[in-house]
Interface confidence: low
Amino acid sequence: EEELQVIQPDKSVLVAAGETATLRCTATSLIPVGPIQWFRGAGPGRELIYNQKEGHFPRVTTVSDLTKRNNMDFSIRIGNITPADAGTYYCVKFRKGSPDDVEFKSGAGTELSVRAKPSAPVVSGPAARATPQHTVSFTCESHGFSPRDITLKWFKNGNELSDFQTNVDPVGESVSYSIHSTAKVVLTREDVHSQVICEVAHVTLQGDPLRGTANLSETIRVPPTLEVTQQPVRAENQVNVTCQVRKFYPQRLQLTWLENGNVSRTETASTVTENKDGTYNWMSWLLVNVSAHRDDVKLTCQVEHDGQPAVSKSHDLKVSAHPKEQGSNTAAENTGSNER
C-alpha cells in the first residue's frame, strides 16, 4: 500500500477579520494509526493550534467527525479571525508511539492572510491657534489594517492638498499596519468655516473611503480690526464715541476704554453679530461728558482678543471754549493712531 500523504490543497487562504477561516487537510490513508495536529509556523517554535488527541481549543472546530474510524478529513475551522492569526498553518500526522506519538508526515502548509479594515481616521491639528497666512500642520492616523496597501488623500473644503507626507508602519511584514500622515495648510481669513479632511482608501472598504475631519474653527484666530468714531451729540455737553471691533474669531474678547490713559470701563464681548465668513463684529460706545474736561481728551479703545497682547486705537477729543459747539464733528478729530 502507498505511504500516507498529508494533503493541504490550499496554498493560501484569505479571510476577513472577524470571519471564520477554513483550513483544509486530508490524508490519503488510514495507516499508520495516530492523531493529527495543526501548527502555526514550522520548527521548534511552532505554535499548537489543534490536537486531535487532547487539549481544549475553543476557537477551533473540525469540519468532519474525527472520531469515525474511516475519517481521513482533518480540516478545521478557526473562528473570529484577527490579524494576529496570520501565518502558515501545517497539518501534521503523528504515528502512535510509546510513551509519545511520533511525527510522521506534514502537509505543505496553508498561508492564512487576514484582511482587516483600517480604523476611522483621526485628524488632529495644532495645539495653539494661528492667524491667517500662517502654515499649520494637521496629522491623520489610522490603524489595524491589513494588507499593507493603502491610499491616503487630504482635502481642504473639497480641494485636494498636495503638501503632505505619509508613512505606513511597520516597513516589514506584520499582522497589521498603521498609517500616519502630516499635511501643511495655509490659513486664510475666510477659514473659520473651513474643514480639513483626511480620506483613507483600502481594499476592505471597496470604494467607500473612510474620512476624518478637523474644523479650522478650532485652529484659526482672526485678529480684530478697530475703528473709533465720534457720533453726533446725544445731549448738550455729551459726546458719544464708538469703537467698532470687526472681523474677529473666536469670540473671546475684552474691551477697555481709557480716558487720558486712565481706565474708564471694561467689558466683555457678548451680543456680537456674526459675519457670513464666521467672524464676529462688535461695537462698544462711551458717553463722554465734555463739560467735565478742561483740556483735550485722548480716548483709547483697547482690545484684548483671545488672550493675545492688546491692540488699541485712539481718538483725540478737542475740548472747545464754546461747549455748545461740541456737537459738531469738527469738535473732535480721529487721529487714527494704532498703538500696541
Epitope: T151, G158, Q206
Partner: antibody
Framework: QIQLVQSGSELKKPGASVKVSCRAG????????MNWVRQAPGQGLEWMGF????????TYAQGFKGRFVFSLDTSVSTAYLQIGSLKAEDTAVYYC????????????????WGQGTLVTVSS | DIQMTQSPSSLSASVGDRVTITCRAS??????LAWYQQKPGKAPKSLIY???YRYIGVPSRFSGSGSGTDFTLTISSLQPEDFATYYC?????????FGQGTKLEIK
Amino acid sequence: QIQLVQSGSELKKPGASVKVSCRAGGYTLTDYAMNWVRQAPGQGLEWMGFINTYTGEPTYAQGFKGRFVFSLDTSVSTAYLQIGSLKAEDTAVYYCARTRGYYDFDGGAFDYWGQGTLVTVSS
Amino acid sequence: DIQMTQSPSSLSASVGDRVTITCRASQNVGTHLAWYQQKPGKAPKSLIYSAIYRYIGVPSRFSGSGSGTDFTLTISSLQPEDFATYYCQQYNTYPLTFGQGTKLEIK
C-alpha cells in the same frame, strides 16, 4: 479574463420567489463590491443597491427594501439577488455589475457587467 | 436623489459624423460620472469613468468631458458598431442614478 456569469431566465408566478446568481471569474470576489441593476422592458437602468463583498453588508436603494435580498457565497465566488412575493411589475432584466475599484476613490462606477437575467412574472 | 437628464433623448446620425450627447445633474457631482453603451438585448458596456477616463479597450473616438453638473460624451467619428443607447450615471451620492438614455440611430 474577468467575467460575471449570471443564471438563466426565469418564469415565475405572482407571489413566488426567485434567486438570481452572479458568478465572478478571473478575480477575487471579495475584492470588489457587487451592484445590482434593474431594467424593465423598454426602460432605462435603475440601481437597486450593492453588497460589500468583504463584509457581506448590503445597501439597498429606497424602492428595493423589503422583498429584495443581496447575499454571497464566497466559497463559490457567487453573489445572489433574491426577490420574494413577486409581482408583475418585477418583470425585468436584472444585471450584476462590479464596482470599479477601491484604491482610486472611485467606488461607484461599474467596470464589468453580467450578461443579465430575465425574470418574467406572469400568471 | 440626484436627477440625471440626458439630451437629446434620441438622435439620427451617419457613419463618420461627430456626435455629442449631454448629461446634466440636478446638483454638483464633481467628476463622479460614468458613461455606458447598451445595444438591444445586451448588457451595458462601460465606456468612461471619472467623467473623462476611458476604460481599457474603449476606442479613442469616445471621449468624455465636464465636471460639476454638465457633462458630455463625444464620438468623434461614428462607426457602424456605435449605434446603441448611451447612459450617463452619477456616483457622487447614494442612491446612484442613471440618465434616461440617449438612443443613437442610423440616419
